[in-house]
Each structure stands twice: as C-alpha cells, then as structure tokens.
C-alpha cells in the first residue's frame, strides 16, 4: 500500500474544512457501532486505541465487520438510506459488527472539497482497521466495506491504506465527477479488497454522470443499463416521493444502488441476476444470458466472489420497486419473408403463458432493426415468475397507437409504396429463460398458417425442451 | 435525565446583540444535534437550523441567514444562538431542541424557551 | 419548502369525545415505507412535547389515547377519549432527509 504521508505530507493537513470549525482540534471522522436496528438508538462511539467501548458495547471480534460509508452532503444530516441499509444488515446478519463511517463535517462541503477529503477518510478507517487488527481473532477477511456515492472512493483508499488486504469491498454507485478515468490509486479500483463488486445505477453518457460509468471492480453491475431506473422517471416521482423535481429523479436513481443492496439482504429468497456482455445494447438485445463460466451471477449482497483478470460489466433488469427480480427470456424469432419487403419496422408483441401465471402484454424492443430472412434475438422480462412455458402469443400492433409507430408505418409506405400486403413468417421461437437457463422451443400451433401481418397474432406451443429440431443438422452454438 | 436548560429572558434594543445559552445534561452532548426553533407571540413554530455539536458545523434555514449564528462551547455541553443587529420582529420566544442524527430528525427534548424582546 | 396546511385551526371537543387533528403536506413526507410526520403538544407558556413521530409511533412517556396514522401527505392525530389536560395547541412536523424542516400553523383543543 502507498504510505499515506508523502510529498503532500501528513494526511491530517490536506483537509478540506471551513475556518470556522478549525478551532478546536477533533478527529474529523467517527465510528458508530450500531447496537440496535432501531435507528433512533445512540449506538456506540468506537475511539482509536480504546479498548473499552468495544467490550461494552459488544463488539464481535470473530463475526463479520460492515462499515458503512456515506458520501457527499449538501444537508449535513445522514439520509434516510443509512437506516434501511444498517437495519437490512442486522437482519441477514444477526451477529455481526455494523459500523457508520461519520464523515459528515468532511462531506458537507463544495464537492470538491469533499472530493479531496476521501484520502483522509480512508485513511481515518485503515488506521481502525489497522488497530482493529492488533486484536486477537480481529480478521480483515471478515471486514466488508459498503460505500455509496463518494462513500465508495473513500473505501477504495481505506483498503489501499490498510495493512493487509480487506475481504471485500461494494461500492453503491460510485460517484462520477472527479473520478471517471482517475488512476487506479485515487479512485475505487479491483486492488482495493480480495473483492470489489460494484452497481452503477446514475451513469449517463451525455450530461453530468453522477455516477462513475467505466467499470471499477472485479465485477461491475449496471441495472436497466446503469442510466434510466424504472419507478424513478419524473411522473413517478412526483407521485411518491419529497419534491418531485429533476433532483429528486437524480436522487432517485442515484440511491437505487442502495436500495438494490438492501433488496439483496432482505429478500433472500427473491435473488436478481446479472449478465456478463460487453455493453448494454448487446445486452437489451438479448444476447448475453449465459452463465457458462461464470458469466452470470447474483447482486449485492449476494453475489458470488469472481477475481477476473479483466474488469466484468454485468447488466440485468429489474422492477420499479422491492422486491427489484425480475425474470428475464432470451427469444430468437427467425423472421422469413417471401416478398422482398424492403426495411421494415413492426411492432412485436408477446405474451407468454406459464404453470404458474401469464404475463402481460411485452413489447419486443428492435434495438436495430427486423432482419429478414435471418434469426432476430430479443430481450423480454416478466416481473412475476410464470413457471414452465406453455405457450406464446405474438401480436403485430396494427392501427398506430402512437406518432412514432404512424411514423413508421409511413417510412414503410414511402419505402415500398406498391407493397401493400406486408406479411412475414415465423415457424417457431426459441426461448431461453435467464434464471434457469433453461432452453425451449415453440413452434407455430398451426404449422400450415405462420404468416404475420400489422393487427394480426400468432399462437405458438412448446414442442420441445433444447433448440435442436430433428431436421437440423448443426449444432446449436451457446451465445456469448 | 435528560434536560436542555436555557438562559434567562432578555430585553434588547433594535441594533443590540444577544446571546442565549441552551445548556444540555443527561446525554453526551456530542452525539445529538441541536435545533434552534422561534415561536413569535401568538404565532407558530418556525426553524431556524440546526449546529452539529461535533463538528461544530452550523445550518441555517434561509430566513435565518446573515444576522443569526449557533456557535458551541463542548466543554460545557452548551449550544448558543447569537442574534446580531436586533430588530423588532426579532422579538419571540427561542426554543433549543436535540435531535438524533441516526433517528427520524424529530425533536424528542426542548428547551423551556428563552423569551426575547427587543423595543426602543 | 414543504409546506403543512393544519385543519382545523380550533376546534372544541367535549371530554370523552374523540379529537381528529388533520395535517397536510404540499408533498410526499413518506421514504421507502416510513412517513417523516411527527406531533407535537404545547400548553401556554412550555415549550413544545413530542406526542407521535414517524407518524404513528407514541413518544415516550405519551399515554396511549394520542395516536397518529397517514402516509404520503395526509397525516391525522387522534386524541380519544379527550381529557381536560389535552387543552393546547397541536403541531404537526415534517422531517424528510432534505431540510429545512416545517411546521404547521397548529390547531387549539379547547375541552367544552
């Protein structure tokens, strides 16, 4: 690890805080072991070098270690996340040590001024650690550093500062501005923890991202893409929570990390998985469902430990609220056209019906566009588990139920204007489930009618487990 | 118990400055913030902010920026609210509360109120 | 800010009888299933008592005919069987993670 005192000299002189609180000479930040799930209780001030509050209080040398790292404020109070996400913790964990990091007089600040009060934080935790340590069956195996926002980047210090190696370090949405593109040692970064899993929830591409985009962990999840969280659009927002304004939607996405780790603790038995691809279109197209080495795996609090040599980015969809599962199907539709149509855009929409439920009506989003003659792969996801597959119902939106599909529909015209009979076929679709991994085959419930026209439905049973037909030859190659 | 003892009524003239004492026993000081709240006669209660009293950290809600400060003495498990070129609307009662920064922010302990008039 | 809207703004309930308190938000005070909405009691010449905080829960040492109930903005105390030392003014307070935090004009009990 690289010393903390270097050419900058002592950490303590690189604070970043107001005149007006330099007076008197404080640890600027604290530890509080919570001792109850109630929110409202005091906890336990740990001190440096004070043995004594760990034995009153009760602290669990051999149990599991939490510290939890807040970041940037512009209120100066913690937020209401904290509470839920230590309270989340004491229930999956009942034994285990659950520590704030207070650094909020180093945090309410400029963010800039925040930004450059991290290495200090993160030096302030390696020290406890460090002293932590000196106790007889104190391990930083057990020691799981959770941070969110600018949080994330002060335990990325923190396990770089520290004497040893911490098991495992999350960050929640680490922050973005003043730290896309850092260098690994000023910034959250694989070398940090044996660990480091990480959800990216506010990354935006164009605009301020308030969350950092390049992936910083040994395994890196990105929710609906990492950009647009469902439940936090400004309808949604206005309706449910404080302040419907653009900060709130902001807070809204920013937060759901949080939220999407607390899910993990509480809702054990509801797991959300998440896909190995190398970008989200790929991924909303369908392509990465696998989890052939390793390639999916749990999020949050849950996920499996994986030391890639590379950086991983993981993508899966969610719901707007808890429990976020959702049940995600890869379908590959080969599309035949007997008449040379030109380009065309429909308007797919399925319907899948299973043992345990049927899902709603779902849109087949075209990422590109309708290949014909050729296998077409998408993306769908049920909120509710629908059990074994029966059967699917596929629509082909008729009259234009909005302007960009009566937009389409006349691009079509303006492109084939003699073609009035636009008709495709669909023998058959194959369905492979993401949490079960699960292959299946529909074929087109009457065989002799697999034509498809705007306003029309085709019916399709399962007939048969796996994606090889008796006439096919080849086999089928495991998508990516 | 837990107490928030405040300083006796003062009575000010427009310009003047003040200074009133919020003292706190019963609790570690440090670990619960404080709430300075006014309550102008026959009227509501209005926030005015709240001080970190570990950090010494001071928030003011925006009417209360400019003429008003929250300043601590630790030692004494003492907050203070200063108010600073009296005016007449200045005068009400001034309450001090404690909040807990891991709770809910409700104000659970308040002081008795420290009465403030301020006339030519 | 947020803004509390009290009603009524007095009212007069005979003894025994139930006192219905109502509170208004002019937007959401709830996160993630818990309403930031707290209650408080002041008699002339005290300051202010704790009564209900995050909306439903009893402050200490409140006996158990003060109750709280709502969600998003709509928030209600109940004070039954009323008894003569409930004659005061009532506060309702909103105290989500993103001050400033406000109160209500308040509401004067008066026991007939």
């Known amino acids: 690890s690289p010393t903390p005192f270097g050419p900058e000299g002592q950490l303590e002189d690189e604070l970043h805080k107001p005149k007006a609180i330099q007076t008197e000479v404080k640890p600027s930040v604290r530890f509080n072991l919570r001792t109850s799930k109630d929110p409202e209780h005091e906890g336990c001030y740990l001190s440096l070098g004070h043995s004594q509050p760990l034995e009153d209080c009760g602290f669990n040398m051999t149990a599991k270690t939490f510290f939890i790292i807040h970041g940037w404020t512009m209120s100066g109070i913690f937020e209401n996340w904290l509470h839920k996400l230590v309270s989340a913790l004491h229930t999956r964990e009942k034994d285990a040590n659950v520590v704030v990091v207070d650094w909020l007089p180093l945090a309410h600040q400029l963010y800039t001024d925040a930004v450059n009060n991290t290495r200090v934080v993160g030096h302030s935790i390696a020290r406890m650690l460090d002293w932590l340590q000196e106790k007889d069956d104190f391990s930083l195996e057990n020691v799981h550093l959770i941070g969110y926002s600018l949080g994330a980047h002060v335990a990325g210090y923190a396990g770089n500062f520290v004497k040893g190696t911490v098991g495992r370090i999350t960050g929640l949405d680490p922050a973005g501005p003043m730290f896309e593109g850092a260098d690994i040692h000023k910034r959250l970064s694989p070398d940090d923890a044996d660990f480091v899993d990480v959800l990216h929830t506010y990354t935006r591409s164009f605009g301020l991202s308030i969350g950092i985009q390049m992936p910083v962990g040994h395994i890196d999840i990105y929710p609906n893409g990492g950009d647009f969280q469902p439940g936090c659009g400004l309808n949604d927002v206005l309706g449910s929570m404080a302040y419907g304004t653009i900060t709130e939607v902001v807070k809204c996405e920013h937060e759901r990390a949080v939220h999407l780790f607390v899910d993990s603790l509480v809702n054990q038995d509801k797991p959300s998985f998440a896909f190995q691809c190398t970008d989200s279109n790929r991924f909303k197209k369908g392509i990465c469902l696998s989890c052939r080495k390793n390639r999916c795996n749990s999020i949050g609090y849950n996920a499996k430990k994986m030391r890639n040599k590379r950086n991983s980015k993981m993508y899966l969809k969610t719901r707007a609220g808890m429990p976020f599962r959702v049940y995600h199907y890869q379908m590959k539709i080969h599309v035949f056209s007997y008449k040379n149509m030109g380009e065309i855009e429909p308007t797919f929409y399925v319907t899948l019906y299973g043992t345990n439920a049927d899902s709603q009506t779902l849109p087949l989003e075209i990422v590109e566009r309708i290949e014909q003659n050729a296998t077409n792969t998408f993306l769908v996801y049920t909120e509710e588990d629908l059990g074994d597959l029966l059967k699917i119902q596929l629509t082909w939106e008729g009259a234009s139920q909005s302007w960009y599909n009566l937009w389409k529909e006349l691009r079509s015209y303006l492109s084939q204007p003699h073609n009035p009979g636009r008709e495709l076929n669909i023998r058959r679709i194959r369905v492979k489930s993401g949490e079960t991994q699960r292959k299946l085959t529909f074929c087109a419930e009457d065989p002799e009618n697999t034509s498809i026209s705007p306003g029309r439905e085709l019916w399709f049973r399962k007939c048969r487990d796996g994606w090889r037909m008796k006439n096919e030859t080849s086999p089928t190659v495991e998508l990516p | 118990q837990i107490q928030l003892v405040q300083s006796g009524p003062e009575l000010k003239k427009p310009g003047e400055t003040v200074k009133i004492s919020c003292k706190a026993s019963?609790?570690?000081?440090?670990?619960?913030?404080m709430n300075w709240v006014k309550q102008a006669p026959g009227k509501d209660l209005k926030w005015m902010g709240w001080i970190n009293t570990y950090s010494g950290v001071p928030t003011y809600a925006d009417d209360f920026k400019g003429r008003f400060a929250f300043s601590l003495e630790t030692s004494a498990s003492t907050a203070y609210l200063q108010i600073n070129n009296l005016k007449n609307e200045d005068t009400a009662t001034y309450f001090c509360?404690?909040?807990?920064?891991?709770?809910?922010?409700?104000?659970?302990?308040w002081g008795q109120g420290t009465t403030l008039t301020v006339s030519s | 800010d947020i803004v509390l809207t009290q009603s009524p703004a007095s009212l007069a309930v005979s003894l025994g009888q139930r006192a219905t308190i109502s509170c208004k938000a002019s937007?959401?005070?709830?996160?993630?299933?818990?309403?930031?909405m707290n209650w408080y009691q002041q008699k002339p010449g005290q300051p202010p008592q704790l009564l209900i905080y995050?909306?439903?829960n009893l402050g200490s040492g409140i006996p158990a005919r003060f109750s709280g109930s709502g969600s998003g903005t709509d928030f209600t105390l109940n004070i039954h069987p009323v008894e003569e030392e409930d004659a005061a003014t009532y506060y309702c307070?909103?105290?989500?993670?993103?001050?400033?935090?406000?109160f209500g004009g308040g509401t004067k009990l008066e026991i007939k």
């Open positions: 509360a404690r909040f807990s920064y891991y709770g809910r922010h409700y104000f659970d302990y």
């Open positions: 019963g609790y570690t000081f440090t670990n619960y913030g």
């Open positions: 995050a909306a439903s």
């Open positions: 937007q959401s005070v709830d996160y993630d299933g818990d309403s930031y």
């Open positions: 307070h909103q105290s989500t993670d993103d001050p400033p935090w406000t």
